[in-house]
Every structure is written in structure tokens, then in C-alpha cells.
């Protein structure tokens, strides 16, 4: 029978670490991490890490009992967890009978939005106490709410990941810019900022009709040339406060009728809050 892995949590040091080993298996040949989605009961989905590793093809894998994987996450707070994946059989060959290296994977470490993870793995038995053993590590940064997978998470939807304000902005005259955008039921307060290397104008927008989408319009006084300037729209939603996903547009000249010109180059960018 071919070896498979059975993985379970192991928070402390592995018991083998306390024993003296004359010989130890070699290090891993490769370690990779990618996010995968799994649906959860609430109708939302969670993002998990798919950690896969490749064993070195030599006789030292005959000593291999397990591979231990530890993940440290750094964002607003630090997290640390480890799993030990035991091999169900001893290795009878250095490569898979069908060809290629022995490759295994574990899906289970939860992924938070916009977090840097350090994933380390080593084979067991590992080096003796006070000795450096062969290990491998990779970094993985989870995406924020603008990511094509993450944006459908409930937390991101509440932060406005699916909201398209469809910003249009035009220069009415030398002193004013008219900004139009589609509001969202997620919140009723917005900040419109006009930048041309420096901030040349801004305005708070309060939209009382929070329950439905409407088209809001605001005329903003400016202190410099506004043509080609960037409009940044910052919403204030209950879930993300002042660090919600920001949206951008560009100021063009208003048509003679005074009707704002629709823009194709609307871009979104996250603020300080990358959920």
C-alpha cells in the first residue's frame, strides 16, 4: 500500500525531539502554499491553506515517520499553530510507483484576510536537541477584499467589496468640481477627496436614504487646477469604519450642458483596512 498522511494538531515539541537520533531523514524538497475555498454552514465560505510538500527521493525517507507544519500569522494580532502529519506506511520506494516524487498535502489552516503567514515544515525524526535540523519555510500573504476570491466573503461584502460607486467627476469651473456616485445601503456617510499631487478639495457627503441605492451629487470647492485630478471616495461603513475600500475616478471637463461625463477608468483601492 502507498503511504498517505494523517494529520492532527501538535502544539508542543514532538516527542521525538527529546530522543537522541543517530540518523535522520533528509529535508523536504519543496514546500508550497495556496489558498482554497470551502463552504461553511452559514452560506459564507472560509479560506484555508493548502500546504503541499515534496519529499526528497533518496533512501533516507525510510526513516521518515511524520512531517510537522507550523504556521505563524502576523496581522493585527499574532497566531501560531502546528499540525503533525504521520505517514501511514513505511516508504518502500524513493519515488511514487507511477513516477514522480512523493507529494503530500494538508488543507486546514484557516486564512484571515490580508495577513502575512510564515509556514515552516520539518521531517520527523528531526535533529537532536541543540542541533540544527533540515527544515523548509515559505511566506504566504493572504489577499484582501479586492481579491477575486475574497471579495465574496460576507466580511468583505459588508466592507463594500461588491459596491461599484460608478464615480463620475467633472470640472465645472476653476473653483468647483462636481462629483456623482452611486450610494450603497451599507452606509450613509462618505468622504470625497480631490488630489492633484496634493489635496485640492474635499467634502463630507451624508446620504440619509441609506436603505436604497441612489445617485448622490456633490459640488466641491477646489484650490488648484482640477482637470486630470484624482477623486477618491472613502465610505464609512459600520464594519470597517474609516478604513473601508476606497474608490477612485478622474476629473474631466464638464460638457457644456453641465452634465458630468461618465468615466471608464474607475479604480478601487483598499484603504488602511485590508480585511
Amino acid at each position: 500500500r502507498e503511504p498517505t498522511v494523517q494529520c492532527g494538531s501538535e502544539t508542543g515539541p514532538s516527542p521525538e525531539w527529546m530522543l537522541q537520533h543517530d540518523l535522520i531523514p533528509g529535508d523536504l524538497r519543496d514546500l508550497r502554499v495556496e489558498p482554497v475555498t470551502t463552504s461553511v454552514a452559514t452560506g459564507d465560505y472560509s479560506i484555508l491553506m493548502n500546504v503541499s510538500w515534496v519529499l526528497r527521493a533518496d533512501a533516507s525517507i525510510r526513516l521518515l515517520k511524520a512531517t510537522k507544519i507550523c504556521v505563524t500569522g502576523k496581522s493585527n494580532f499574532q497566531s501560531y499553530s502546528c499540525v503533525r502529519c504521520n505517514y501511514t506506511e513505511a516508504f518502500q520506494t524513493q519515488t511514487r510507483p507511477s513516477g514522480g516524487k512523493w507529494t503530500f498535502s494538508y488543507i486546514g489552516f484557516p486564512v484571515e484576510l490580508n495577513t502575512v503567514y510564515f509556514i515552516g515544515a520539518h521531517n520527523i525524526p528531526n535533529a537532536n536537541m541543540n542541533e540544527d535540523g533540515p527544515s523548509m519555510s515559505v511566506n504566504f500573504t493572504s489577499p484582501g477584499c479586492l481579491d477575486h476570491i475574497m471579495k465574496y466573503k460576507k466580511k468583505c461584502v459588508k466592507a463594500g467589496s461588491l459596491w461599484d460607486p460608478n464615480i463620475t467627476a467633472c470640472k465645472k469651473n476653476e473653483e468647483t468640481v462636481e462629483v456623482n456616485f452611486t450610494t450603497t445601503p451599507l452606509g450613509n456617510r462618505y468622504m470625497a477627496l480631490i488630489q492633484h499631487s496634493t489635496i485640492i478639495g474635499f467634502s463630507q457627503v451624508f446620504e440619509p436614504h441609506q436603505k436604497k441605492q441612489t445617485r448622490a451629487s456633490v459640488v466641491i470647492p477646489v484650490t488648484g487646477d482640477s482637470e486630470g485630478a484624482t477623486v477618491q471616495l472613502t465610505p464609512y461603513f459600520p464594519t470597517c469604519g474609516s478604513d473601508c475600500i476606497r474608490h477612485k475616478g478622474t476629473v474631466v471637463l464638464c460638457p457644456q450642458t453641465g452634465v458630468p461625463f461618465p468615466l471608464d477608468n474607475n479604480k478601487s483601492k483598499p484603504g488602511g483596512w485590508l480585511p
Partner: antibody, heavy 118, light 107 residues
């Protein structure tokens, strides 16, 4: 049955290169590493040059030969190759290809190619 | 690199005798050892792998033993076809190395 076929001999000039072939049959080529071994003379010992995994072309060399030998495979024809470069009289030897077993014992050997640098 | 020291370098024996060839590794190779036989002008042939396992078609008069760093190949009741050179090889981790060889000749 498993067969590894090598040409009998190659005569090359000093400073030139030679590409030795090892045509295989009778087994799944991508399932086993292929090794190359040098034997300097009739009574001389065996030296492991390196090995290649035909599945993904991963190569491991004996440091002594890393600037002398280049290992490749052609999966479509189930053949392994070793190119020897910048040849000198020291490289005159018999070169064997040898297929690994479950681990790297050499279960099957080619007949060997005698390389003469002259 | 692991050094493999084989002894004796040569041996002159008669048909029907028993011989033992030894191989010492410079470090523990965890029983990852093979033995090969080579006849003049021919390629080496696998005799024994994993210290004790006989390769297909190898007569039972051949036997291997050992562990750690010390290994041996025993040939009981030598036959005329057993004469030639014998090599040990470790396959613990690359780079793999062979012993210097033992030349077995008829007395």
C-alpha cells in the same frame, strides 16, 4: 524484460564533447531514476557520476563531475543521455547507465560505452 | 561524502571454498548497501540489495549481512562462475560511492 542499450565505443578528440545515449525498454521510463557510472579501466573501480529523474528531469551530480557531465532525458523515446564536455585523456573510460531499483541500488545496467580520448 | 572501504583487494581461492568480503562505511548508512559482481569485459550485475536481499536469479550460496558501518558478503561453496570482481555500494544519500573492489581469482 528490462533493457538498457548503449553504443559500444566512441572515439573523440581532446577538448571536444561527446553525447552518450542509453535507450531503455521493458519498463515505465518515468518511474525510476537513471544513474551514470564511470569505470576508468578494466581493473579500476566504479565512480557514480550522477542521476536524473525522468519524471521531472531533476538531476543530482557527484560534485567531482558537475562541470564534466550534463544529464538529460527524452521521455518520448524513453532514452537517457550524458554529454561529456572538454574531454581529456583522464576521461577515457567505460561509461555505464544504470537504472535504480526501489531505492538507488542499480538493478539494471547498460553494456557500457568505451570513450577513448585521443 | 561517505567513503566505502572494501577488503581484501584481491583473493585467490579454490572452487568449493567459502569466502567473505567486507565493506566498511565511513559513517552509518542505515543498511542501505548493495553488492555487485562484474566479470571481465562485462557490466556489473546486482547481487544483493538492502544488505541481505538477493537480486533475481542470484544463487542462494550468496548471502549478505551487517548493519551500521560494517557489512559483508559471503559466498559458500564457490563455483567457477563466481570468479570476477565484487563491489559494494551505499545508497543512503547522494553522492553514492562504491568500494574499491575485490578481485576473486581461481587458485
Amino acid at each position: 524484460q528490462v533493457q538498457l542499450q548503449q553504443p559500444g565505443a566512441e572515439l573523440v578528440r581532446p577538448g571536444a564533447s561527446v553525447k552518450l545515449s542509453c535507450k531503455t525498454s521493458g519498463y515505465t521510463f518515468i518511474s525510476y531514476w537513471m544513474n551514470w557510472v564511470k569505470q576508468g579501466g578494466p581493473e579500476q573501480g566504479l565512480e557514480w557520476i550522477g542521476r536524473i529523474d525522468p519524471y521531472d528531469s531533476e538531476i543530482q551530480y557527484n560534485q567531482k563531475f558537475k562541470d564534466k557531465a550534463i544529464l538529460t532525458v527524452d521521455k518520448s523515446s524513453s532514452a537517457a543521455y550524458m554529454q561529456l564536455i572538454s574531454l581529456t585523456s583522464e576521461d577515457s573510460a567505460v561509461y555505464y547507465c544504470a537504472r535504480s531499483g526501489g531505492f538507488d541500488w542499480f538493478a539494471y545496467w547498460g553494456q557500457g560505452t568505451l570513450v577513448t580520448v585521443s | 561524502d561517505i567513503q566505502m572501504t572494501q577488503s581484501p583487494a584481491s583473493l585467490s581461492v579454490s572452487v568449493g571454498e567459502t569466502v567473505t568480503i567486507t565493506c566498511r562505511a565511513s559513517e552509518n548508512i542505515n543498511s542501505n548497501l548493495a553488492w555487485y559482481q562484474q566479470k571481465k569485459g562485462k557490466s556489473p550485475q546486482l547481487l544483493v540489495y538492502d544488505v541481505t536481499n538477493l537480486a533475481d536469479g542470484v544463487p542462494s550460496r550468496f548471502s549478505g549481512s551487517g548493519s551500521g558501518t560494517q557489512y559483508s558478503l559471503k559466498i559458500n561453496s564457490l563455483q567457477s562462475e563466481d570468479f570476477g570482481s565484487y563491489y559494494c555500494q551505499h545508497f543512503w544519500r547522494p553522492p553514492y560511492t562504491f568500494g574499491g573492489g575485490t578481485n576473486l581469482e581461481i587458485k
